[in-house]
Interface confidence: low
């Protein structure tokens, strides 16, 4: 790496993957192992993220970009840049301090994450329960028996499943 020649700030010419080394007359030095600089002109390199424990490496650190982690099977990412891993549960369960527990009667969870939520109260909408709820599925509401005239069949379908990776927060 040749010495930078900028008259204003000699460090501004140091590219990503290097740092401006004050100890060596502001020469652009390569980032040491396990560190990176993603932009030019930096006076230090940042320490690479380490994916350990329940985290596993999705993308190795390079001299110009940080490592990226995801979660080991059975866990899912939470937070910006997968800053946290949370344990998966089965549908019909929610995560508690002591692990996955079945949803209580009257609640359900149709995902591997998130909390158990109460079944829809059909009567609030003046409807009746057409299909009973389970730990994994909400009830299906339909017209109340009085509304069912011959030939009519207006059933409210269950809410569409949420996209994977989106849980109610």
């Amino acid at each position: 790496f040749e010495r930078t020649r900028s008259l204003q700030d000699p460090c501004s010419n140091c590219p990503a993957g290097t740092f401006c080394d004050n100890n060596r007359n502001q020469i652009c030095s390569p980032c040491p192992p396990n560190s990176f600089s993603s932009a030019g002109g930096q006076r230090t390199c940042d320490i690479c993220r380490q994916c350990k424990g329940v985290f596993r490496t999705r993308k190795e650190c390079s001299s110009t970009s940080n490592a990226e982690c995801d979660c080991t099977p059975g866990f899912h990412c939470l937070g910006a840049g997968c800053s946290m891993c949370e344990q998966d549960c089965k549908q019909g369960q929610e995560l508690t301090k002591k692990g996955c527990k079945d949803c209580c009667f009257g609640t359900f969870n149709d995902q591997k994450r998130g909390i158990c939520r109460p079944w829809t109260n059909c009567s609030l909408d003046g409807k009746s329960v057409l299909v009973n709820g389970t730990k994994e599925r909400d009830v299906v509401c339909g017209p109340s028996p009085a509304d069912l005239s011959p030939g009519a069949s207006s059933v409210t379908p269950p809410a569409p499943a949420r996209e994977p990776g989106h849980s109610p927060q």
Epitope: G53, V54, L78, G79, M84, C85, E86, T96, K97, I115
Partner: nanobody, 122 residues
């Protein structure tokens, strides 16, 4: 930078004892619940125990209750797991983890150590 470093693992005979340590740095240790997890060969991660920041709230998985004791020394930024009456099924890599309580009913373990291997075998 948050760091957690476990030590104290090793080979021990059934019925024996080990004390695991987890030295932490990079955050105010006493502000956080801490947990021990373990992962047996070919199995999933299992929560073992946790302790509140002040050490007043402690809980254990049923599988270790009465045999394992969790403790912490906030002055030394250290977490411990005393394991007695060890069994073959306790063989696992043991991890300490920092708990981040984000909302009621949701606990995320946002920082982990590298793990220490405990082998219980005659």
């Amino acid at each position: 930078e948050v760091q957690l470093v476990e030590s104290g693992g090793g080979l021990v005979k059934p019925g024996g004892s080990l004390r695991l340590s987890c030295a932490v740095s990079g955050f105010t240790f006493s502000d956080y619940y801490m947990s021990w997890f373990r992962q047996a060969p070919g199995k999933g991660l299992e929560w073992v125990s946790h302790i509140s920041g002040s050490g007043t709230t402690i809980d254990y998985a049923d599988s270790v209750k009465g045999r394992f004791t969790i403790s912490r020394d906030n002055a030394r930024d250290s977490l411990y797991l005393q394991m007695n009456s060890l069994r073959a099924e306790d063989t696992a890599v043991y991890y300490c983890a920092r708990e981040d309580i984000r909302m009621p009913g949701t606990t995320d373990f946002d920082h982990w150590g590298q793990g220490t291997l405990v082998t219980v075998s005659s």
